[in-house]
């Protein structure tokens, strides 16, 4: 499901239930947001005018979406997952009797649950979780999120120490579903795929529709923006990132000290000033480096270039080239080559293109 692509999230209370004092409503909603900000890097601030990310509404019956409320009891509230417009908004059924205590329906407890949905959580099957689908009063003074709730929200946003999430509102990220979108570099990292572009990378977990956008600097503060090539040696938990004539080594997602180093340590001639794309093939234990219209092949075991290179891309990768932007290896038999907004699935055993796609096809666009 969707997540908020930023750290700083605004909310606005559109109107107030007559069942409670306004201050008590404000307090209950503020404390409910705090429950989630305590365990994530998210920060919530209340605004009183203008367009908030999350609109809190008290309404009865039909109220502007397909999900009309049903009078007292039954559905107490509902909330929409992250997104623009109605996305994130939390609606509370005015036909309930909202309270600060155990009588009626406790606003704080209901709001914690609904805000969970506003942040992208679904329901939990753990009866102890606040995201369990049925309402049950618990003492609000000793209320705690369950381990399942925390696991769920941190799988979306990380823990509070990780300042690893997503750009702030003023950083403009490229539009993921722009049909003209191209990438600077792409690589697998375990079961994830990292797509690099400018200051950002998108993270795609294999076979799942969810993707998240991140600032490169928020994950690796010592690395530059504009990564130009990347490859992974999964068996060693290593990722190599390239920009200009330098490269960085990431081990177990942490940058190694004493980097960057010169790309010429791989054995490139001096005229090579940057790498366009790189991919490691674990079947041959070779890394392919693409530079302009040529490529080199590097033996990772012997730590040296194979003889007879460079070769022309177009000669040895039928239908690919003359230049490429990015490439990664997947499913034991494919290279995915990126050229501008196009992507080519290339079977390296059959040595031919098997599919032509848009570069952003991995994101359900």
């Amino acid at each position: 499901g969707p997540v908020w692509r930023k750290h700083y999230i605004t909310y606005r209370i559109n109107n107030y239930t007559p069942d409670m004092n306004r201050e008590d409503v404000d307090y209950a909603i503020r404390k409910a947001f705090q429950v989630w900000s305590n365990v994530t890097p998210l920060k919530f601030s209340k605004i009183n005018t203008g367009m908030a990310d999350i609109l809190v509404v008290f309404a009865r019956g039909a109220h502007g979406d397909f999900h009309a409320f049903d009078g007292k009891g039954g559905i107490l509230a509902h909330a929409f997952g992250p997104g623009s417009g109605i996305g994130g908004d939390a609606h509370f059924d005015e036909d309930e009797f909202w309270t600060t205590h155990s009588g009626g329906t406790n606003l704080f407890l209901t709001a914690v649950h609904e805000i969970g949905h506003s942040l992208g959580l679904g329901h939990s099957s753990d009866p102890k979780a606040v995201m369990f689908p049925t309402y049950k009063y618990v003492d609000i003074n000793t209320f705690r999120l369950s381990a399942d709730d925390i696991r769920g929200i941190q799988s979306l946003y990380g823990d509070p120490k990780e300042n690893q999430r997503l750009p702030n509102p003023d950083n403009s990220e490229p539009a993921l579903c722009d049909p003209n979108l191209s990438f600077d570099a792409v690589t697998t990292v375990g079961n994830k795929i990292f797509f690099f572009k400018d200051r950002f990378f998108w993270l795609k977990v294999s076979e799942r529709p969810k993707t998240s956008v991140n600032l490169i600097s928020s994950l690796w503060p010592t690395l530059p923006s504009g990564i130009e090539a990347a490859y992974e040696i999964e068996a060693r938990n290593q990722v190599f990132l390239f920009k200009d004539d330098k490269y960085w080594l990431i081990s177990n997602l942490r940058p190694e000290p004493n980097y960057p180093k010169s790309i010429h340590s791989f054995g490139f001639p001096n005229f090579v000033k940057k790498i366009d794309a790189a991919v490691f093939n674990p079947r041959f234990y070779r890394t392919y480096f693409f530079v302009d219209n040529q490529y080199w092949r590097y033996d990772e075991r012997r730590q040296m270039m194979d003889p007879g290179y460079p070769k022309l891309i177009t000669k040895n990768f039928q239908g690919i080239g003359p230049k490429i932007d990015a490439v990664f290896y997947s499913k034991n038999k494919y290279y995915y080559f990126f050229q501008g907004s196009n992507q080519f699935e290339y079977d390296f055993l059959l040595q031919r293109i098997t599919k032509t796609l848009k570069s952003n096809s991995w994101f359900g666009c």
Partner: antibody, heavy 122, light 103 residues
């Protein structure tokens, strides 16, 4: 590129039945709400029915309740509208529309098919 | 039940004109209002969502405003391709439509 392609329209007698299909491609179909919207000749748009991602939650306009059934097959990326007890006033172009949301429907239709014409006449 | 009233039902204007179409709900719908454009023989296309957000690819001469019960769609300078029918919509309810014709 998102594509929605309706089929199954045609001429049917009052009281008859018809099943419309909408084949979806270019996006991951299963997480999204899907809807049918119709337009009688020379008239405005009328929302007909909507269905949640898993198919468990459905909504209908009062004008078709009890006569039309919306369904979906996520394995085939296809939306359906079974129309029974058809009346002359059901004559319209029927559009399939994709909601921008899952979980709860926003009723915001970001992509539409080209429509299929249903004519109910004796 | 919520009802949407759109006005005017038709409108004649010239290229370069500024045009405003209004939509009124009989109860608050917050900012949950969308605008669509439909050309003859074509499917509707989303222009504006959440009252004022411009759908990707829609020219900036289109703008929307309003919240609660009163909403407007404005075309700042009409272009030949803008002559079409416009609908406001909230969940399962569409306005009656406004046909924009060349004067």
């Amino acid at each position: 590129e998102v594509q929605l392609l309706e089929s199954g329209g045609g001429l049917v007698q009052p009281g008859g039945s018809l099943r419309l299909s909408c084949a979806a491609s270019g996006f991951t179909f299963s997480p999204y709400w899907m809807h049918w919207v119709r337009q009688a000749p020379g008239k405005g748009l009328e929302w007909v029915s909507g269905i949640g991602p898993s198919g468990g939650l459905t909504f209908y306009a009062d004008s078709v309740k009890g006569r039309f059934t919306i369904s979906r097959d996520n394995s085939k990326n296809t939306l359906y509208l079974q129309m029974n007890s058809l009346r002359a006033e059901d004559t319209a172009v029927y559009y399939c529309a994709k909601d921008i949301r899952g979980a709860y429907s926003s009723g915001l239709f970001d992509h539409w098919g080209r429509g299929t014409l249903v004519t109910v006449s004796s | 039940d919520i009802q949407m009233t759109q006005s005017p039902s038709s409108l004649s204007a010239s290229v370069g004109d500024r045009v405003t179409i209004t939509c009124r709900a009989n109860q608050s719908i917050y900012t949950y209002l969308n605008w669509y454009q439909q050309k003859p023989g074509k499917a509707p296309e989303l222009l504006i969502y959440a009252a004022s957000s411009l759908q990707s690819g829609v020219p900036s001469r289109f703008s929307g405003s309003g919240s609660g019960t009163d909403f407007t769609l404005t075309i700042s300078s009409l272009q030949p391709e803008d002559f079409a029918t416009y609908y406001c919509q909230q969940a399962g309810i569409f306005g009656q439509g406004t046909k924009l014709e060349i004067k």
